[in-house]
């Protein structure tokens, strides 16, 4: 029978670490991480890490009992967890009978939004105490709410990932810019900022009709030339406060009729939060 892996949590040091080993298996040949989605009962879905590793093809594989994988996550707070994946059979060949290296994977480490993860793996038995054993590590940065997969997560939807404000902005005259955008039921307070290398104007927008989408309009006084300036719209939603996903547009000249001219209505920029 071909070996498979059975993985389970192992928080402390492996028991083999306390034993003296004359010989140990070699290091891993490759270690990779990619995110995968799984459905959860709430109708939402979770993102998990698919950690896959390739064993080195030589006789030292015969000593291999398990591979231990540890993940450290760094974002607002630090997390650390490990799993030990035991091989169900001893290896009788250095490569798979059908050809190619022995490759295994574990799906289970949860992925938070916009987090840097350090994934390390080593074979067991590993080096003796006070010795450096062969190990392999990779970094993985999980995407934020602007990612095409992540944006449908409930947490991201509540932070406005699916909201398209369809910003239009035009220069009415030398002193004012008119900004129009579509509101969202997610919140009722917005900040519109006009930037042309420096901030040349801003305005708070309060939209009382929070429960329905409406088209809001605000005229913003400016202190410099506004044509070609950037409009940044920052929403204030309960879930993300002042660090919600920001959206951008560009100021153009108003048509003679005074109707704002739409441009760049799909540009989005994450705030400092990026949930």
């Amino acid at each position: 029978r071909e070996p498979t892996v059975q993985c389970g949590s192992e928080t402390g040091p492996s028991p083999e670490w306390m034993l003296q080993h004359d010989l140990i298996p070699g290091d891993l040949r490759d270690l990779r991480v990619e995110p995968v989605t799984t459905s959860v009962a709430t109708g939402d879905y979770s993102i998990l890490m698919n950690v896959s590793w390739v064993l080195r093809a030589d006789a030292s594989i015969r000593l291999l009992k398990a591979t231990k994988i540890c993940v450290t996550g760094k974002s607002n707070f630090q997390s650390y967890s490990c799993v030990r994946c035991n091989y169900t059979e001893a290896f009788q060949t250095q490569t798979r009978p059908s050809g190619g290296k022995w490759t295994f994977s574990y799906i289970g480490f949860p992925v938070e939004l916009n987090t840097v993860y350090f994934i390390g793996a080593h074979n067991i038995p590993n080096a003796n105490m006070n010795e450096d054993g062969p190990s392999m590590s990779v970094n993985f940065t999980s995407p934020g709410c602007l990612d095409h997969i992540m944006k449908y997560k409930k947490k991201c939807v509540k932070a406005g990932s699916l909201w398209d404000p369809n910003i239009t902005a035009c220069k009415k005259n030398e002193e004012t810019v008119e900004v129009n955008f579509t509101t969202t039921p997610l919140g009722n307070r917005y900040m519109a900022l006009i930037q042309h290398s420096t901030i040349i104007g801003f305005s708070q927008v309060f939209e009382p009709h929070q429960k329905k989408q409406t088209r809001a309009s605000v005229v913003i006084p400016v202190t410099g030339d506004s044509e070609g300036a950037t409009v940044q719209l920052t929403p204030y939603f309960p879930t993300c406060g002042s660090d919600c996903i920001r959206h951008k547009g560009t100021v153009v000249l108003c048509p003679q009729t005074g109707v704002p001219f739409p441009l760049d209505n799909n540009k989005s920029k994450p705030g400092g939060w990026l949930p």
Partner: antibody
Framework: QVQLVQSGAEVKKPGASVKVSCKAS????????MNWVRQAPGQGLEWMGR????????QYNQKFKDRVTMTRDTSISTAYMELSRLRSDDTAVYYC???????????WGQGTLVTVSS | DIQMTQSPSSLSASVGDRVTITCRAS??????LAWYQQKPGKAPKLLLY???NLADGVPSRFSGSGSGTDYTLTISSLQPEDFATYYC?????????FGGGTKVEIK
């Protein structure tokens, strides 16, 4: 049955290159590493390196690392070993040898004599 | 690299004799050892692998033993077709190395 058939004898001048082929049959070519071993006249056996036909991973003996190139063509189940910048002490019989479950050499080609002489 | 030292480098024996060849590795090779027989002008032939396992078609008069760094090939009753050169080889990870060979000649 498993067979490894190598290309014929070669005579080369110092500084030249030689490419030896090894055609495998009787088993799934991509399932086993292919090794190259040489034997100078009246001398012992010397492992040069190995190639995994599945993905072309190669491991060389450091002694030959700068001069040897191992390749394979899975479509015709053939492995190749090219040795460059030949010297007179490269005169030897070159063997391809298929690994077993691990790297014992269960099957050998008939050998290719490469003579390097000016 | 692991060095393989074979002894003796040559020996003379008669048909029916018991012959023993030893092989010492410069470090523990965890029983990852093979033995080959080679006759003049021919490719080597695998005799034993994993110290004790006979390769296909190899007569049972050939046997192997040992562990760690020290290994032995024994021919229990030498036959005329056994006069050849014998090599040990470790396969405890590349680079693989062979012993210098033992030539078994007719006394």
């Amino acid at each position: 049955q498993v067979q490894l058939v190598q290309s014929g004898a070669e005579v080369k001048k110092p500084g030249a290159s030689v490419k030896v082929s090894c055609k495998a049959s009787g088993y799934t070519f991509i399932s086993y590493w292919m090794n190259w071993v040489r034997q100078a006249p009246g001398q012992g056996l010397e492992w040069m390196g190995r190639i995994d036909p599945y993905d072309s991973e190669i491991q060389y003996n450091q002694k030959f690392k700068d001069r040897v190139t191992m390749t394979r063509d899975t479509s015709i189940s053939t492995a190749y070993m090219e040795l460059s910048r030949l010297r007179s002490d490269d005169t030897a019989v070159y063997y391809c040898a298929r690994s077993g479950g691990f790297d014992w050499f269960a099957y050998w080609g008939q050998g290719t004599l490469v003579t390097v002489s000016s | 690299d692991i060095q393989m030292t074979q002894s003796p480098s040559s020996l003379s024996a008669s048909v029916g004799d018991r012959v023993t060849i030893t092989c010492r590795a410069s470090e523990n090779i965890n029983s990852n050892l093979a033995w080959y027989q080679q006759k003049p002008g021919k490719a080597p032939k695998l005799l034993l692998y994993d110290v004790t396992n006979l390769a296909d078609g190899v007569p049972s008069r050939f046997s192997g033993s040992g562990s760690g760094t020290d290994y032995t090939l024994t021919i229990s009753s030498l036959q005329p077709e056994d006069f050849a050169t014998y090599y040990c080889q470790h396969f405890w990870g590349p680079p693989y190395t062979f012993g210098g060979g033992t030539k078994v000649e007719i006394k």
